[in-house]
């Protein structure tokens, strides 16, 4: 008896973080023996959608012409072959931005920081939110979460970095999210350029938690150190 059918691969184009109103295509790639593809969305009746395979039958396309809140969430796909259904794909998390107005991102004491010193990036929302995310452009794993505990909502989150090195320099944005769904994010903040001076001989920072990635040091996720602020927010690494 043959083993279980290999799980398909699930991905989104142009990506898994989509602005409200934009189109996105979800692809599920299985094998040439696939007869049907099924897409399931967490907390929605299954199947969420079914599609016949595209020639040469090893993948199917699920189109979302205009991104809305209803499409944001966690997806898995399956394919059916003559011997039955496959294992589920790894999950795809489809995130929508533009659900809330943009937060404000600033650097304390300044976005111009000397290597070896400390800086705190402050993401502030004029209405209470329960998750704040910090994103560094062109980082392989750019998301940092600060999520409030016990449902308490906050107007801000602090992302402390110490000691700062050249790796911390770059362009940052932050997002905020409400308790309705963590797949719904605000518009992005305006970008903040963090400039690190005197950093020619800096050693690479040692992350506070190891990260498995094939990327080089410049692509490591941002890893600020220091205690989480007294705001009731808890740090989550994504």
């Amino acid at each position: 008896q043959a083993g279980p059918l290999p799980k398909p691969t699930l991905w989104a184009e142009p990506g898994s973080v989509i602005s409200w109103g934009n189109s996105v295509t979800i692809w599920c790639q299985g094998t040439l023996e696939a007869r049907e593809y099924r897409l399931d969305k967490e907390e929605s009746p299954a199947p969420w959608d079914r599609q016949n395979p595209l020639e040469p039958k090893n993948k199917a396309r699920f189109s979302i012409p205009s991104m809305t809140e209803d499409y944001a969430g966690r997806y898995r796909c399956y394919y059916r072959s003559p011997v039955g259904w496959s294992q589920p794909s790894d999950p795809l998390e489809l995130v929508m931005t533009g659900a809330y107005s943009k937060p404000t991102l600033s650097a304390l004491p300044s976005p111009l920081v000397t290597s070896g010193k400390s800086v705190t990036l402050l993401c502030q929302s004029r209405s209470p939110m329960d998750t704040f995310l910090l994103i560094k452009e062109r980082a392989a794993h750019p998301l940092l979460h600060l999520r409030s505990e016990h449902g308490a909502q906050q107007h801000q989150a602090e992302f402390p970095m110490s000691p700062v090195t050249s790796v911390h320099g770059g362009t940052y944005r932050c997002f905020s999210s409400h308790g309705f769904s963590h797949y719904l994010l605000s518009h992005p903040s305006d970008p903040l350029e963090l400039i690190v001076s005197g950093s020619l001989e800096d050693p690479r920072p040692s992350p506070t938690r190891s990260v498995s990635t094939a990327a080089g040091p410049e692509d490591q996720p941002l890893m600020p150190t220091g205690s989480v602020p007294h705001s009731g927010l808890r740090r989550h690494w994504e």
């Epitope: 409200w20 809305t68 809140e69 929508m96 533009g98 659900a99 809330y100 107005s101 943009k102 404000t104 502030q124 004029r126 209405s127 209470p128 107007h155 801000q156 409400h178 309705f180 719904l184 605000s186 518009h187 305006d190």
Partner: antibody, heavy 120, light 110 residues
Framework: EVQLVESGGGLVQPGGSLRLSCAAS?????????ISWVRQAPGKGLEWVSS?????????YYATWAKGRFTISRDNSKNTLYLQMNSLRAEDTAVYYC???????????WGQGTLVTVSS | DLVMTQSPSTLSASVGDRVTITCQAS??????LAWYQQKPGKPPKLLIY???TLASGVSSRFSGSGSGTEFTLTISSLQPDDVATYYC????????????FGGGTKVEIK
Amino acid sequence: EVQLVESGGGLVQPGGSLRLSCAASGFSLSSSYWISWVRQAPGKGLEWVSSIDSGSVGITYYATWAKGRFTISRDNSKNTLYLQMNSLRAEDTAVYYCARHGDNWALDLWGQGTLVTVSS
Amino acid sequence: DLVMTQSPSTLSASVGDRVTITCQASQSINSWLAWYQQKPGKPPKLLIYKASTLASGVSSRFSGSGSGTEFTLTISSLQPDDVATYYCQHGYIRGDLDNVFGGGTKVEIK
């Protein structure tokens, strides 16, 4: 020209209802702003009524005293903000302004206001 | 509850005087404070945002300072055109607020 224009005010009896409108031009209500209703009773100070977020979810907040009687909403296709006011009382008599919260978190654009008079 | 307390409620000063209005928040609002000027029959006009930044087109006679809970609006040299009521406002929006504005300060010329 970037502006807000309120309409829908008038004389209404106590216990009655009224819907105010605020038409935005020169910018989109669905861009990254909050919009609020602020009122001012004759000879009194400014009083925040309600706000709605520009994001697609459209989170709303109300002053504690406005909850249950007032409802803020928006129609992006008409680029218009609304305030539905029910169970009106004499103390709701005021000029009602709509105002936009800018990136600086301040109210950087105001309408001219519309007068609501609650009287029998 | 976040409450803005403005003082004085009325202020009478001579032309050319330096005038100061204060606004106190019952809890920290960082620098998210704005000041407005309102003349009778007109909507408010933004003067200062983020506690100390002058809004576009506003006279440099006006300045703002403070952070956290204590804020000040200063008119360096009072002019007849400055006769108006001034309001402070914090920038937060949430559901536990009675108001986001201070009670107002009416400025008159002696």
